[in-house]
């Protein structure tokens, strides 16, 4: 099996994560997809997800997370705006794919967040003076429900929807985007646990 | 391992057709899109189109050269794909290769060795 | 369409010298700083090889004195250390639109 690895980013309070998950195969474009984090000893907890069927390039948010599906480049891009310290923890992308096991992308994010501003005096993020305006055209998604008998190790998600009125509009100055990019699960344990086409048709949004 | 396997190439005359095989091995040839790429004799790599998978209504796109005159099909149960050419022309002459992608818009990392397609009265 | 350019044409290098490979394309091929371009070699009589792929990420089997950077419409390919077996034609590729196009090669010789 795929080692599980992580990647670490520490941000300041204020700043925007952003990453772009990786799922590259066509087969999973219209599936839908969650942002999950993941507590020492607990299930993973899916906090927004994108619509069923996933639609392309329509923001769904949910409180300061911002999901949206690009299906013709195989990308989910999640953004965490103006982060707070308790934001901290580990993270994940994951594929639903009911009744099977969800598909994680790899790699985990570890999510450091500190106190302070982007422009504090010898931080390591560069600073910008960008506004982001997230448009009060996003919608919210409803997450299933999903439990699995796996380890925790191989983060099965256990998905309740951590739903809050989303704010209209999201100013934020001063932010710093961290960019990364998504593995997909090797492409042998893909090939093994890839669901087929015919299951995956009647999710197609056309 | 990953094999791609090209054929029915050869000799043709200009205005006529020709239907290229590309058959696939050792991965799961539902998944990926199918391209084909064509070098003419001592010149650059040239991409021909591609299609992509039922997922996405095997979906079709082709150079603007190649437009309305080839057609890239697929056969998901023969492990194959197929490029139709009509109305031929002489600079279409050229070796055309099947490729296969990583993924959504992904690099080509697994090639055919090609096949030779030469239009010439 | 996007037109990738590459330069030079031709380039002879010394073995164990820096081989730099330019392409540059005429609109940009990243999405969401993601870059969508890709280098391949290829050798007479055979078909190309992979060599980077997303702009910098090393082709898995391929050594790592090839090396790729870049972003947007401006892409290197650096040989850091030439070896007679990289004799070869090397093409920039860009998927971030249809069509996918190719740049016009750029042949190494040894010097």
């Known amino acids: 099996a795929t080692k599980l690895t992580e990647e670490k980013y520490e941000l300041k309070e204020g700043q925007t994560l952003d990453v772009k998950c990786d799922y590259t195969l066509e087969a999973f474009a219209s599936s839908q997809k969650a942002w999950q984090i993941i507590r020492d000893g607990e299930m993973p907890k899916t906090l927004a997800c994108t619509e069923r069927p996933s639609k392309n390039s329509h923001p769904v948010q949910v409180g300061r997370i911002i999901l949206e599906d690009y299906h013709d480049h195989g990308l989910l891009r999640v953004r965490m705006v103006n982060l707070q310290v308790e934001d901290s923890g580990l993270y994940q992308c994951v594929i639903y794919q009911p009744p099977k096991e969800p598909h994680m992308l790899f790699d985990r994010i570890r999510l450091v967040v500190t106190k302070g501003f982007s422009g504090t005096p010898g931080s390591n993020e560069n600073s910008t003076q960008n506004v982001y305006k997230i448009p009060p055209t996003t919608t919210k998604a409803l997450c299933p429900l999903y439990t699995s008998p796996r380890t925790v190790t191989q983060a099965p998600p256990k998905s309740t929807a951590d739903v809050s009125t989303p704010d209209s509009e999201i100013n934020l100055t001063n932010v710093t985007d961290i960019i990364r990019e998504q593995k997909l699960i090797s492409e042998e344990d893909l090939e093994q646990k890839l669901i087929s086409e015919e299951d995956l048709h009647h999710h197609h949004h056309h | 391992e990953v094999q791609l396997v090209e054929s029915g190439g050869g000799l043709v005359q200009p205005g006529g057709s020709l239907k290229l095989s590309c058959a696939a091995s050792g991965f799961t040839f539902s998944t990926y899109a199918m391209h084909w790429v064509r070098q003419a004799s001592g010149k650059g790599l040239e991409w021909v189109g591609r299609i992509r998978t039922k997922s996405s209504n095997y979906a079709t796109y082709y150079a603007a050269s190649v437009k309305g005159r080839f057609t890239i099909s697929r056969d998901d149960s023969k492990n194959t794909a197929y490029l139709q050419m009509n109305s031929l022309k002489t600079e279409d002459t050229a070796v055309y290769y099947c490729?296969?992608?990583?993924?959504?818009?992904?690099?080509?990392?697994?090639w055919g060795q090609g096949t030779l397609v030469t239009v010439s009265s | 369409d996007i037109v990738l350019t590459q330069s030079p044409d031709s380039l002879a290098v010394s073995l164990g010298e820096r081989a730099t490979i330019n392409c540059r394309a005429s609109e940009s091929v990243d999405t969401f700083d993601y870059s969508f371009l890709h280098w391949y070699q290829q050798k007479p009589g055979q078909p190309p090889k992979l060599l980077i792929y997303?702009?910098?990420n090393l082709e898995s089997g391929v050594p790592d004195r090839f090396s790729g950077s870049g972003s947007g419409t401006d892409f290197t390919l650096t040989i850091s250390s030439l070896q007679a077996e990289d004799v070869a034609v090397y093409y920039c590729?860009?998927?971030?639109?249809?069509?996918?196009?190719f740049g016009q090669g750029t042949k190494l010789e040894i010097k």
């Open positions: 997303r702009a910098s």
């Open positions: 490729t296969r992608d990583m993924g959504i818009r992904r690099q080509f990392a697994y």
């Open positions: 590729q860009q998927s971030n639109e249809d069509p996918y196009t």
